[in-house]
Interface confidence: low
């Protein structure tokens, strides 16, 4: 057992049939020693009496919010929450695996650049009795601080009959130094908690490794005279890390006809425009990704042939 | 070439190069080995490794001010890395091809190394660890992180010089 | 000559988890690998997994993974093996070895883990 | 991952008799980096044989390794009393070491 935060308990309990549970001692926070009695939850039967009560902790039953009283006052609590290892694994219930970059992936992490600011979310089908607290550092030794502020609930989808809830939360590492070859990981904890029942998920990067771009913005179209020709012009996004000179973009120009199966040119750059054939009907899409290290090419930003 | 006692690198040749040792880098990867290390997570190791680090100069700022702190920080990493790639680890079982492009990768280290630091003017580098030869395993699991660390480590050394030639080339 | 010494017998309970200790003498423990092989009552050898102290990576067999976690503190010349969320069949002799190009030549004595309730 | 598969699973044996262990791999062992190991009853391994083929430090000179792709033999030219054990073929030819499951020779 161990505390979570004031007055809230985590019970590690293995998990299988006829599994023994674990012996819980609850001591009521008072100056008080006699007449004590205890309850749990909103019933009213009195579970023991004294300063301690020892209980048995075997299924959700037996977690929730203990109550030590005095005489009809209420001297303290203590909120008790099970933590299962199934077969010797921690339980995974409450987030749901995105499956990728690969199995068992529930926490998704993104930066647009390299100021130490990045985003994390997770998926759940859960709607009520929700909470979700996060925790990050960089290093876990001797960590240095990344400031996480609250999970938000981000995005709601319909998933056939089923409803799934997206949730998000920002960081920022306290002192990101940008131009510096990370040697140490980020570390994301976050524990999550539903009803009576606690669960912990961790993700570790660098944040080099999470990089996505916005995509280019201000994408232009001139046409070249007297030609099938038009030159694509864009910019860097402003949400990139500046210099440019520096935090270089590397760029993929894509032509795509109306229907999917007709042949798409690419053209690769490193510089902000290109000049590509505009056929009819036809769109235009430009991505970016970082010139030096291959992370996620940002989304497409697109414009007409027309 | 980088001349002793702090006069300026050939930027743009030692841009074109580090653009390149990155495209190799990263088409080395898939050939350390058949399995997705990332499974195991990037876990703190012992820094055995030349990191470029916050206090070494290689910001813009930095770089304006005084670029050799940066520069030999980078030789350093380059002439560490380029003993590792021609170590046994590399060289032993499983062996790469030898059009591989980790001796493409090897060799280019060598070449931006020798840009930023002609014959006969000596900065300190790093000792290389000295590894007996080792099993296929352990070879295997330290081409992977090497790899991967050296993408990392050339990432930055091709910003320096891709914001050197920009904005420091005479 | 290089010596491998193991820490003592321990007997675990279901879900717990145990930590061998495997301490090397008389030669450069960075310069090597150390594999970490188990052995059942009766039965063959099992090779759990192996570290590279000078580097601090570590390498596991599919079986073991999530569970087992080698590390090496050099400092101590010492290797290490945790196995979490032991069951009975966990019940065996764990040995650590020095991992060469020429295979494992010089082992540990082994350490009986036993796993009962 | 590579499986070892070694044959006889008992080997019965007079002293002076030679001893013929097979050692077959489910896939080309890279290198041919297989080691054989003899052990006696509670106690650790022992290197005999590396590289399939090389005889580790203060092994007797009747212990003989050969044997190359997937087809491997340990030999033991005449069987002193000593020299009865398990004996394992391992390869580490790969990321992930393996072990064959052992050939016990026992005396007839």
């Known amino acids: 057992i161990w505390e979570l935060k004031k007055d809230v308990y985590v019970v590690e309990l293995d998990w299988y049939p006829d599994a023994p549970g674990e012996m819980v001692v609850l001591t009521c926070d008072t100056p008080e020693e006699d007449g004590i009695t205890w309850t749990l939850d909103q019933s009213s039967e009195v579970l023991g009496s004294g300063k301690t009560l020892t209980i048995q902790v075997k299924e959700f039953g037996d977690a929730g919010q203990y109550t030590c009283h005095k005489g009809g006052e209420v001297l303290s609590h203590s909120l008790l929450l099970l933590h299962k290892k199934e077969d010797g694994i921690w339980s995974t219930d409450i987030l749901k695996d995105q499956k990728e970059p690969k199995n068992k992936t529930f926490l998704r992490c993104e930066a647009k650049n390299y100021s130490g600011r990045f985003t994390c979310w997770w998926l759940t089908t859960i709607s009520t009795d929700l909470t979700f607290s996060v925790k990050s550092s960089r290093g876990s030794s001797d960590p240095q601080g990344v400031t996480c502020g609250a999970a938000t609930l981000s995005a709601e989808r319909v998933r056939g009959d089923n409803k799934e809830y997206e949730y998000s939360v920002e960081c920022q590492e306290d002192s990101a130094c940008p131009a510096a070859e990370e040697s140490l990981p980020i570390e994301v904890m976050v524990d999550a908690v539903h009803k009576l029942k606690y669960e912990n998920y961790t993700s570790s990067f660098f944040i080099r490794d999470i990089i996505k771009p916005d995509p280019p913005k201000n994408l232009q179209l001139k046409p070249l005279k007297n030609s099938r020709q038009v030159e694509v012009s864009w910019e860097y996004p402003d949400t990139w890390s500046t210099p440019h000179s520096y935090f270089s973009l590397t760029f993929c120009v894509q032509v795509q006809g109306k229907s999917k199966r007709e042949k798409k040119d690419r053209v690769f750059t490193d510089k902000t425009s290109a000049t590509v054939i505009c056929r009819k009907n036809a769109s235009i899409s430009v991505r970016a990704q970082d010139r030096y290290y291959s992370s996620s090419w940002s989304e497409w930003a697109s414009v007409p042939c027309s | 070439r980088a001349v002793p006692g702090g006069s300026s690198p050939a930027w743009t040749q030692c841009q074109q190069l580090s653009q390149k040792l990155c495209t190799l880098a990263w088409s080395a990867h898939p050939l350390v080995g058949h399995m997705d290390l990332r499974e195991e997570g990037d876990e703190e190791t012992t820094n055995d490794v030349p990191h470029i680090q916050c206090g070494d100069g290689c910001d813009p700022q930095g770089l304006r001010d005084n670029s050799q702190f940066c520069l030999q920080r980078i030789h350093q990493g380059l002439i560490f890395y380029e003993k590792l790639l021609g170590s046994d680890i590399f060289t032993g079982e499983p062996s790469l091809l030898p059009d591989s492009p980790v001796a493409q990768l090897h060799a280019s280290l060598l070449g931006l190394s020798q840009l930023l630091q002609p014959e006969g003017h000596h900065w300190e580098t790093q000792q290389i660890p000295s590894l007996s030869p080792s099993q296929p395993w352990q070879r295997l699991l330290l081409r992977f992180k090497i790899l991967r660390s050296l993408q990392a480590f050339v990432a930055v050394a091709a910003r320096v010089f891709a914001h050197g030639a920009a904005t420091l080339s005479p | 000559q290089v010596q491998l010494v193991q820490s003592g017998a321990e007997v675990k309970k279901p879900g717990s988890s145990v930590k061998v200790s495997c301490k090397a003498s008389?030669?450069?423990?960075?310069?090597?690998?150390i594999s970490w092989v188990r052995q059942a009552p009766g039965q063959g050898l099992e090779w759990m997994g192996g570290?590279?102290?000078?580097?601090?990576?570590?390498n596991y067999a599919q079986k073991f993974q999530g569970r087992v976690t080698i590390t090496a503190d050099e400092s101590t010349s010492t290797a290490y093996m945790e196995l979490s969320s032991l069951r009975s069949e966990d019940t065996a002799v764990y040995y650590c070895?020095?991992?060469?190009?020429?295979?494992?030549?010089?082992w540990g004595q082994g350490t009986l883990v036993t796993v009962s309730s | 991952d590579i499986v070892l598969t070694q044959s006889p699973a008992t080997l019965s044996l007079s002293p002076g008799e030679r001893a013929t262990l097979s050692c077959r791999a489910s896939?080309?062992?890279?290198?041919?980096?297989l080691a054989w190991y003899q052990q006696k009853p509670g106690q650790a391994p022992r290197l005999l044989i590396y590289?399939?083929?090389s005889r580790a430090t203060g092994v007797p000179a009747r212990f003989s390794g050969s044997g190359s792709g997937t087809d491997f033999t340990l030999t033991i030219s005449s069987l002193e009393p000593e020299d009865f054990a398990v004996y394992y073929c391992?390869?580490?030819?790969?990321?992930?070491?393996?072990f064959g499951q052992g050939t016990k020779v026992e005396i007839k």
């Open positions: 070895a020095r991992d060469i190009y020429a295979g494992m030549d010089v």
């Open positions: 008389g030669g450069t423990f960075s310069n090597y690998a």
């Open positions: 570290i590279i102290p000078m580097f601090g990576y570590a």
């Open positions: 896939q080309s062992v890279l290198g041919n980096y």
């Open positions: 590289g399939a083929s």
């Open positions: 391992q390869q580490y030819s790969h990321l992930i070491i393996t």
